[in-house]
Amino acid sequence: PLATIPVSTTSLTSSEGSTISTPSVDISTPVTTSIVGDQCSRCKNGGFWDGLKCQCLTPYYGESCEEVVNSIDIAPPETVSAQMELTVTVTSVKFTDELKNHSSQEFREFNKTFTEQMNIVYSGIPEYVGVNITNLRLGSVVVEHDVLLRTKYTPEYKTALDNATEVVKQKITKVTTEQIMTNDNCSALMCFNTTGTQVQNITVTQYDPVEECRQKAEEYEDYFLVEYRDQKPYCISPCESGFNASKNCNHGKCQMSQNGARCLCVTTETHWYSGEDCNQGTQKSHHHHHH
């Protein structure tokens, strides 16, 4: 059953035994209570009782799944890829029907020679993985094929793959212009018809760490953001320390709420701390401010 419980927190105890005071604000939090048999577990926010403890859904944790994590695991792919659909016309081979059959001796031989030729053409492109013939048709031999590119994931992967696709275009244009038949014969490994070279389509892996971060943060999506460290993206809330966006709570504890990150200020034996960043200290005996 879905219930709305008014939460009014006035103080928390820190690990040193001091009190953390918070304004008494009524935050109406939707709470899902999971009941298993006679066990009413109070697993909130979609969490479920596994018989021993609450199993929380991202981005929640805690005994009752009532707290919000400071960072969410996002896993970019190890590598990202691009696929270019190209067509070239090979003039140094006469088309025969056997070339349509991918298990024929003719197709296998053509595939081997074409792959060898393309490996030479694209040898200077570090992202180049290989080619895959999708169709052969009459005219001398029209070769519909995919050029496969791959690179390690970095924040700039799209630029790297875009650059690689441009180099592929340049190189295939160059070879199909230079390796042409002379006196009805070819002196290269393969010869081409210059006008038969076309780039039909380019598909690049779509991975957006910001999108993944926002999706996993759910209703806290506006408060989680992506920061990079060693080219790796981290999905963090301002309560996660050590990042540019980290909130400095000084004499307090950072806590996420549905209104964003806020500081819960501590009260020590000698001071009350207040202010948005808990940086205003008031001495209990003298009542004057330290900034």
């Epitope: 003039t91 140094s92 081979v93 006469k94 025969t96 056997e98 024929s104 001796q105 003719e106 031989e109 053509f110 081997k112 020679t113 060898e116 038949m181 009805d184 014969n185 070819c186 002196s187 290269a188 490994l189 393969m190 010869c191």
Partner: nanobody, 124 residues
Framework: DVQLVESGGGVVQPGGSLRLSCAAS????????MAWFRQAPGKEREVVAF????????YYADSVKGRFTISHDNSKNTLYLQMNSLRAEDTAMYYC?????????????????WGQGTQVTVSS
């Protein structure tokens, strides 16, 4: 796989004749390309002639035109090179090459199947 075995090489005087043979096996079709290449010591392998076994195409290098004749016997799956008016510069190792494709290339790298070669020496 395709197997090629050459024969017919030997020593011959300038102006003489020789007939080379190349027996092919392992083809799944009766329409393919066969060629003769040669390689003299210290030189690159070069095309002599090629033929499509369906009779659609023959090619001769300029240096052998009018003196050499390439032919193919479909019933025997055998390639021949009739060499007449032999010259000292024809001395080389002669190789039979084949492709399951109908090739129009004189680049040896485009030809996947090769025989072991037969030596032709033209000397007085």
């Amino acid at each position: 796989d395709v197997q090629l075995v050459e024969s017919g090489g030997g020593v011959v005087q300038p102006g003489g004749s020789l007939r080379l043979s190349c027996a092919a096996s392992g083809y799944t079709s009766n329409r393919y390309s066969m060629a003769w290449f040669r390689q003299a010591p210290g030189k690159e392998r070069e095309v002599v002639a090629f033929i499509w076994t369906d009779g659609g195409r023959t090619y001769y290098a300029d240096s052998v035109k009018g003196r050499f004749t390439i032919s193919h016997d479909n019933s025997k799956n055998t390639l021949y090179l009739q060499m007449n008016s032999l010259r000292a510069e024809d001395t080389a190792m002669y190789y039979c090459a084949a492709s399951s494709l109908l090739l129009q290339t004189i680049n040896p790298r485009a030809w996947p199947y090769w025989g072991q070669g037969t030596q032709v020496t033209v000397s007085s």
